[in-house]
Interface confidence: low
């Protein structure tokens, strides 16, 4: 079942390769369990960057080795992607699934274009 998901159109990563954005989903009821997935679109290919499932009792928790971290508040999820390099510049799509209780709802945002600029190397100092 379709569900509206909103996310910013453009985000600039910090010089340390960190980008943060808010993913907000429209839901008529309170889901007990939600899955959030970040997908990177390159041409017609979509690859999963990270995913996490959280409940109303527990905070959003990505895997320890994930490139993502996040916090949740109501229908908003604050996502942070770390370790980005210039080659990672691209469209990052937020996918939200309301897992439980039924019915299952899924929605995808239009994507956030994340621009990553590699920092200039520091010149050698004498």
């Amino acid at each position: 079942k379709g569900m509206h998901v909103a996310q910013p159109a453009v985000v600039l990563a910090s010089s340390r390769g960190v980008a943060s954005f808010v993913c907000e989903y429209g839901s008529s009821g309170n889901a007990a369990e939600v899955r959030v997935t970040v997908l990177r679109q390159a041409g017609s290919q979509m690859t999963e960057v990270c995913a996490a499932t959280y409940t109303v009792e527990d905070e959003l928790a990505f895997l320890d080795d994930s490139t993502c971290t996040g916090t949740s508040s109501g229908n908003k999820v604050n996502l942070t992607i770390q370790g980005l390099r210039a080659m990672d510049t691209g469209l990052y799509i937020c996918k939200v699934e309301l897992m439980y209780p039924p019915p299952y709802y899924v929605g995808m945002g239009n994507g956030t274009q994340i621009y990553v600029i590699d920092p200039e190397p520091c010149p050698d100092s004498d």
Partner: antibody, heavy 119, light 107 residues
Framework: QVQLVESGGGVVQPGRSLRLSCAAS????????MHWVRQAPGKGLEWVAV????????YYADSVKGRFTISRDNSKNTLYLQMNSLRAEDTAVFYC????????????WGQGTMVTVSS | DIQMTQSPSSLSASVGDRVTITCRAS??????LAWYQQKPEKAPKSLIY???SLQSGVPSRFSGSGSGTDFTLTISSLQPEDFATYYC?????????FGQGTKVEIK
């Protein structure tokens, strides 16, 4: 790419046990509920069991309740099915499958592993 | 448990034919229906979910319709690779249940 690979099938005598494994790759395994589905030779598909992403809930088909146990190890990206007190009617190809939600339209299937229960 | 009944159980068709398979649920399941294709000695492959949504990568000649208790899978122009067995499955409630299958054979 997203992949599920089952193993552990074989020939076993009635009343004995067997454990199937399903190795997942290409997606965040710890974020998905996972299922086992089986297919007896020449027959249709039968759902067997489901386990939620964190192992907190498990449901079974009546035909296997009390005999089969579904489990998972998210640190190893692996799903298991412990099958005890096997019967001839358990002879089937066992598939692990991923579903976007818990009851599920199964969007990814493994290749299957054959279990034959025979004396 | 919800019973799923497919018809016909088998059919013969030619390449280019329009093929329709029906699936009936013993009680209302809203749009919580999926269709799968299975070839001999292979795992099932997801075609359609939520009654009418095409799974990613599935050719547009496959379409699904229906809600409540009556559902249809249509192949608009049968291709050689479409000869297989097709299953419907409800996922409205536990346990998820499948139809008995429809085998599509070459005429």
């Amino acid at each position: 790419q997203v992949q599920l690979v089952e193993s552990g099938g074989g020939v076993v005598q009635p009343g004995r046990s067997l454990r199937l494994s399903c190795a997942a790759s290409g997606f965040t395994f710890s974020s998905y509920g996972m299922h086992w589905v089986r297919q007896a030779p020449g027959k249709g598909l039968e759902w067997v069991a489901v386990i939620w992403y964190d192992g907190s809930n498990k449901y079974y088909a009546d035909s296997v309740k009390g005999r089969f146990t579904i489990s998972r190890d998210n640190s190893k990206n692996t799903l298991y099915l412990q099958m005890n007190s096997l019967r001839a009617e358990d002879t089937a190809v066992f598939y692990c499958a991923r579903a976007p939600n818990y009851i599920g339209a199964f969007d990814v299937w493994g290749q299957g592993t054959m279990v034959t229960v025979s004396s | 448990d919800i019973q799923m009944t497919q018809s016909p159980s088998s059919l013969s068709a030619s390449v280019g034919d329009r093929v329709t398979i029906t699936c009936r649920a013993s009680q209302g399941i809203s749009s919580w229906l999926a269709w799968y294709q299975q070839k001999p000695e292979k795992a099932p492959k997801s075609l359609i979910y939520a009654a009418s949504s095409l799974q990613s990568g599935v050719p547009s000649r496959f379409s699904g319709s229906g809600s409540g208790t009556d559902f249809t899978l249509t192949i608009s122009s049968l291709q050689p690779e479409d000869f297989a067995t097709y299953y419907c499955q409800q996922y409205n409630s536990y346990p998820p249940t499948f139809g008995q299958g429809t085998k599509v054979e070459i005429k």
